[in-house]
Amino acid sequence: LKGQEFAPSHQQVYAPLRADGDKPRAHLTVVRQTPTQHFKNQFPALHWEHELGLAFTKNRMNYTNKFLLIPESGDYFIYSQVTFRGMTSECSEIRQAGRPNKPDSITVVITKVTDSYPEPTQLLMGTKSVCEVGSNWFQPIYLGAMFSLQEGDKLMVNVSDISLVDYTKEDKTFFGAFLL
Amino acid sequence: LKGQEFAPSHQQVYAPLRADGDKPRAHLTVVRQTPTQHFKNQFPALHWEHELGLAFTKNRMNYTNKFLLIPESGDYFIYSQVTFRGMTSECSEIRQAGRPNKPDSITVVITKVTDSYPEPTQLLMGTKSVCEVGSNWFQPIYLGAMFSLQEGDKLMVNVSDISLVDYTKEDKTFFGAFLL
Amino acid sequence: LKGQEFAPSHQQVYAPLRADGDKPRAHLTVVRQTPTQHFKNQFPALHWEHELGLAFTKNRMNYTNKFLLIPESGDYFIYSQVTFRGMTSECSEIRQAGRPNKPDSITVVITKVTDSYPEPTQLLMGTKSVCEVGSNWFQPIYLGAMFSLQEGDKLMVNVSDISLVDYTKEDKTFFGAFLL
């Protein structure tokens, strides 16, 4: 019995069928970040909760040392939200003598690392200037898209300023991926 | 014949195969909210259109009384966007005597209610300070992630201020979920 | 042997089983937009990279002339992020004599075109007032949801101002869809 017996007639070749419930999946949630050494010229990576509360990894999708490890090749939907919070940035001061200030910014990058490839690949980036009038500001950046990944690829989330990440609640800052 | 005959060799146990077309799915769209009684100390829940225009529910995923009802256990991708609009918030006034105002904010929460569990669980939260200079402001908050849900779980979308939700168009404010 | 042999007992009717790997999928990435004639009263459509870098189309999902062409009927998850950047809009000037200026705005629309239907359908809209204090601003708008599409439907991404789209990096501005 071959998988393609179930295919619509206009498709000739089929990968083997497989149950959805066994596909690699993970949803990771925020934890408080401890100060660590960051690589020079690279945004620091967040580390994550992978088993408590809403967090889980399943079907050979493993989390280790800030990375989600891709256990089999295929197309994955990858997503993350990071909520940032901070004090008024200096650019929210009214422009002095007609000279506008350079805006502060917040950035989230979902990065793929392939051991056989020297440079990490930036898959997704959300970047936003922050120029708030008022005292404290807070806001999320959400990202999500589909990518073709290879077994052994590693995924991480990098942020422009780790000290601005809201780590207080698992529903505010998270990271996930699942095989389609 | 067992589902695992189609499994890659490194996997031993498989859930039964099932067709994708029969999986529980819903996409709900905004309708105008009329003034109602809210539960104390809880953000009000939005109610939704579930069958007109772009909205639908299928394969035993039902919508009733502000809730999406989960018909079978499994991993679901859940998403919502809420577009807010309002008048200039007082915090956008220039800071008086060096004393910054507390910012207004807008918040969306996707909440899970399990009858056997006394407290609702907040699955996803998007929260943003609003400090706009200008008259009218408008902006969306988008959320989406994967969660393991149980048959009988109920999902709702709560917002910090129901009267700021943009109800004019079905493409601006919506809520959906589908079994992976 | 019928697909429904694998169904949970509470489901009677099943669509034929099919392998996940053969489903129509696409992830398109930003390219620099060349000036073109836009339709009156319609936001201009973006064109996309469909095969270089992170971009791909597969399993009969084709990209042509700003459109993703849907090759088979079913429920699709559709997503896009557009990163905008610009100079301070005039509404960020401090309100003169108590008269607030009308805010500038940025808008992304994911639109469906069905040849048999005269009017395009707006599936998703993200719209945001832009009133930044400071010089240059930049920010993303992300959209994603599930829709029932028909074979032959075409999808495009429209934006309010094509000249504000950040076309510099494939991870900042993108568009994708996949059959569930």
Epitope: - | I162, S163, L164 | -
Partner: antibody, heavy 118, light 107 residues
């Protein structure tokens, strides 16, 4: 049932002030903006402003700025609109109204007739 | 302020007629346009929001259309209880403003 009940008719002299009340029931008073709209005899509708009952924040039409004050007492789910320095052209029916969104008026009070006459 | 105009200011019609009222805004208000009906001596009643979406409980003979600056309220098959004054209102920006009204009278 959502209801707004306004205070009774008033007759005032020019230069005086009037304070109209609006008691809300059937919904969460602090959850929705409450507006005041007036209608002069035989004329159209004129929006005066809103109050946000949870915070007490207000937004007044420029025309009434400096003459109108909108307040609320959340303990009794009641909003108030005070208009000072009354003139004869302030003679009108004053309505309170509440909307499911801040920009429209779903439910209206029965109206309070205010007559300004010497 | 955004100025709303309505036409006609009044019209005469019979039961069963199809009636159309237009409303124009002095600048684009997107779809933030509401319609109200007012019977003599009564408070206004909310009919249509978002230019075209019927408020719950409003009969389906009422419909709205338009976006930007030009809007229309249509009553298909006028009923005796529909003889009233109709107001449009923009919810796009403060101050919220109303049209001057259109009086629908019995012919």
């Amino acid at each position: 049932e959502v209801q707004l009940v306004e205070s009774g008719a008033e007759v005032k002299n020019p230069g005086a002030s009037v304070k109209v009340s609006c008691k809300a029931s059937g919904y969460t008073f602090t959850g929705y903006y409450l507006h005041w709209v007036r209608q002069a005899p035989g004329q159209g509708l004129e929006w005066m402003g809103w109050i946000k009952p949870n915070s007490g924040g207000t937004n007044y039409a420029q025309k009434f700025q400096g003459r109108v004050t909108m307040t609320r007492d959340t303990s009794i789910s009641t909003a108030y609109m005070e208009l000072s320095r009354l003139r004869s052209d302030d003679t009108a029916v004053y309505y309170c109204a509440v909307g499911g969104s801040y920009d429209a008026f779903d439910i209206w009070g029965q109206g309070t007739m205010v007559t300004v006459s010497s | 302020d955004i100025v709303m105009t309505q036409s006609p200011s009044s019209l005469s019609a019979s039961v069963g007629d199809r009636v159309t009222i237009t409303c124009r805004a002095s600048q684009s208000i997107s779809s933030y346009l509401n319609w109200y009906q007012q019977q003599p001596g009564k408070a206004p009643k909310f009919l249509i929001y978002g230019a075209s979406r019927l408020q719950s409980g409003v009969p389906s003979r009422f419909s709205g259309s338009g976006s930007g600056t030009d809007f229309t309220l249509t009553i298909n098959s006028l009923q005796p209880e529909d003889f009233a004054t109709y107001f449009c209102q923009q919810g796009y920006s403060s101050p919220f403003t109303f049209g001057p009204g259109t009086k629908v009278e019995i012919k």
